[in-house]
């Protein structure tokens, strides 16, 4: 960057090189060039010469003043016009940054996705700071008082093998940058209470011809957790409002859930689960589409993006890919 150049003088910023966005700042340039009494001192921001708010302080020093500086980053350098020199002589340069102190981190959440071997902690960092902001995640055992700290720029994955102070912990997040430091409230966790079961996946759907046609959704999870509660939500793709069905589930076999749906309508389904009585849910599964047949039943080979119709007794939809859910991060 600009800071690596060889200087023939000195450039500095008041109040500091990193300052709060919107502040008034002064940039000072002091020449120390052999055999040169500068006729004029020039300031450049991002390579463009500044024309206004420059004050000559003495023979070797000038000041550039900015009101309400709002740029997150700028490269400043200054030059001197020396007698008998055809070109301007470079004095020095500096990268400057403006931004905000961190907000208090809130909504600290820690979960263990089954089989991951990690505890994943996330938080709401608040408003954008524009400057380098680091987060320290503190994990303190309520049983041994031992504390581990993890330095990160965003979320953190902590190996569950490193959590050797029992099952109960306090977790909190400290945010710090050049403009300030803030700290979250402490979150109390029990490792057994924050496990999110292995993802539930809808594998296929079929509509069976009966007096009243019914649609069966087949879904499963690789979880080893015994007591699991799940929700399946579904709606016609033209609707805004979801219908929700609740299940107490035992995943020793593939689940079959029955729905009585309107004919000849494209529906979308999603499922999510949690360990019964615990706090955190899985994110909703990928969107699964199924179109119900007209009153005369028909068959589809897949109804994910493309609907291919054949005559027959059932309509089946098979999950062949993944579409991103509309709110995958919904774990609370």
């Amino acid at each position: 960057g600009i800071t690596n150049i060889n200087c023939s003088g000195h450039i500095w910023v008041e109040p500091a090189t990193i300052f709060k966005m919107g502040m008034n700042i002064s940039i000072y340039c002091q020449a120390a060039i052999k055999n040169c009494q500068p006729r004029k001192l020039h300031f450049y921001k991002n390579g463009i010469k500044e024309r206004f708010q420059i004050t000559r302080i003495n023979k070797t020093t000038a000041r550039l003043w900015y009101k309400n500086f709002l740029e997150p980053h700028a490269s400043m350098y200054c030059t001197a016009e020396c007698p008998k020199h055809f070109q301007e002589t470079l004095i020095c340069g500096k990268d400057i940054s403006s931004g905000y102190p961190p907000d208090i981190p809130d909504e600290v959440t820690c979960v263990i996705y089954e089989y991951s071997g990690n505890m994943t902690c996330t938080w709401n960092a608040g408003k954008l700071t524009y400057i380098d902001t680091k987060y320290v995640v503190h994990v303190k055992s309520l049983e041994t008082e031992e504390e581990q700290q993890y330095l990160t720029s965003s979320y953190i994955n902590i190996s569950t093998d490193s959590l050797q102070g029992g099952k109960k912990y306090l977790v909190w997040v400290q945010a710090a940058n050049a403009l300030g430091m803030e700290e979250s409230k402490q979150l109390q966790i029990h490792l057994d209470d924050i496990v999110i079961p292995s993802a539930a996946v809808i594998s296929r759907a079929e509509t069976i011809n009966a007096t009243v046609p019914k649609t069966i959704i087949y879904w499963d999870s690789q979880t080893t957790i015994e007591k699991v509660s799940c929700e399946m939500r579904y709606k016609a793709t033209t609707n805004q409002t979801w219908n929700v069905k609740e299940f107490d589930t035992n995943f020793t076999y593939v689940q079959q859930s029955e729905f009585y749906l309107e004919p000849n309508i494209k529906y979308v389904f999603q499922v999510r689960c949690q360990e019964t009585g615990k706090r955190y849910w899985q994110p909703w599964s990928s969107l699964f589409f199924h179109k119900t047949p007209e009153t005369v039943p028909q068959v589809t080979s897949k109804a994910f993006q493309h609907d291919t119709w054949n005559s027959g007794l059932t309509v089946a939809s098979i999950s062949t890919g993944h579409l991103t859910s509309d709110n995958r991060g919904d774990i609370g």
């Epitope: 320290v136 309520l142 008082e145 031992e146 581990q148 306090l170 700290e183 402490q186």
Partner: antibody, heavy 121, light 112 residues
């Protein structure tokens, strides 16, 4: 068994700085640990100054009153912690202790012998 | 800012007496509290940590209790060597930017 050996007594002028060292033996420097500093003015109670956390990264924490005046550092190569106090005033006359449990807990099983710092013109 | 308030500031007692010192935190510190004994000219000595756990080598007449905000140090039968000053200390977290002191003001136990 952790042992903490502090530098000797100091007499300082107001406005100057003092740097007290604390050499630790018996700490596993591959593990996480806190090293903290506590002072005690004559006839007064214990006053926490700050701590340094040494682990996968280094973090320092200071009492509100000590911010900007106290700097705590650690040199892992010599197993030594330092506490520097600047802009000394007469009310900084106290015995300064380093303290740790040799791990990442904040209670102190082990204390240095104390360093008397006298601030006088 | 967690503040630690210790009471009483001093007390007079006789050998064999049961002595109780209390410490109150201005916010929940769970069981993260330690008690120290200090004699004149000496460094403090850890007695109790995690509110109720006895440090190595500390006689069983010392005990600690409490959690959250209210804590107690009890000496069941005061011995001559127990006349000293006692301090509580919160050991929850020091990373909070606003901490002033983590110790209580101290309780001096004197001979009646």
């Amino acid at each position: 068994q952790v042992q903490l050996v502090q530098s000797g007594a100091e007499v300082k002028k107001p406005g100057s700085s003092v740097k007290v060292s604390c050499k630790a033996s018996g700490i596993d420097f591959n593990s996480n640990y806190y090293m903290c500093w506590v002072r005690q003015a004559p006839g007064q109670g214990l006053e926490w100054m700050g701590c340094i956390y040494v682990g996968s990264h280094v973090n320092t924490y200071y009492a509100n009153w000590a911010k900007g005046r106290v700097t705590i550092t650690a040199d892992e190569s010599t197993s030594t912690a330092y506490m520097e106090l600047s802009s000394l005033r007469s009310e900084d006359t106290a015995v300064y202790y380093c303290a740790t449990s040799g791990s990442s807990v904040l209670y102190f099983k082990f204390w240095g012998q104390g360093t008397l710092v006298t601030v006088s013109s | 800012d967690i503040q630690m308030t210790q009471s009483p500031s001093s007390l007079s007692a006789s050998v064999g007496d049961r002595v109780t010192i209390t410490c109150q935190a201005s916010e929940n510190i769970y069981s993260f509290l330690a008690w120290y004994q200090q004699k004149p000219g000496k460094a403090p000595k850890l007695l109790i940590y995690s509110a109720s756990k006895l440090a190595a080598g500390v006689p069983s007449r010392f005990s600690g209790s409490g959690s959250g905000t209210d804590f107690t140090l009890t000496i069941s039968s005061l011995q001559p060597e127990d006349f000293a000053t006692y301090y509580c200390q919160q050991t929850n977290r020091y990373s909070n930017p606003d901490i002033y002191n983590v110790f209580g003001q101290g309780t001096k136990v004197e001979i009646k």
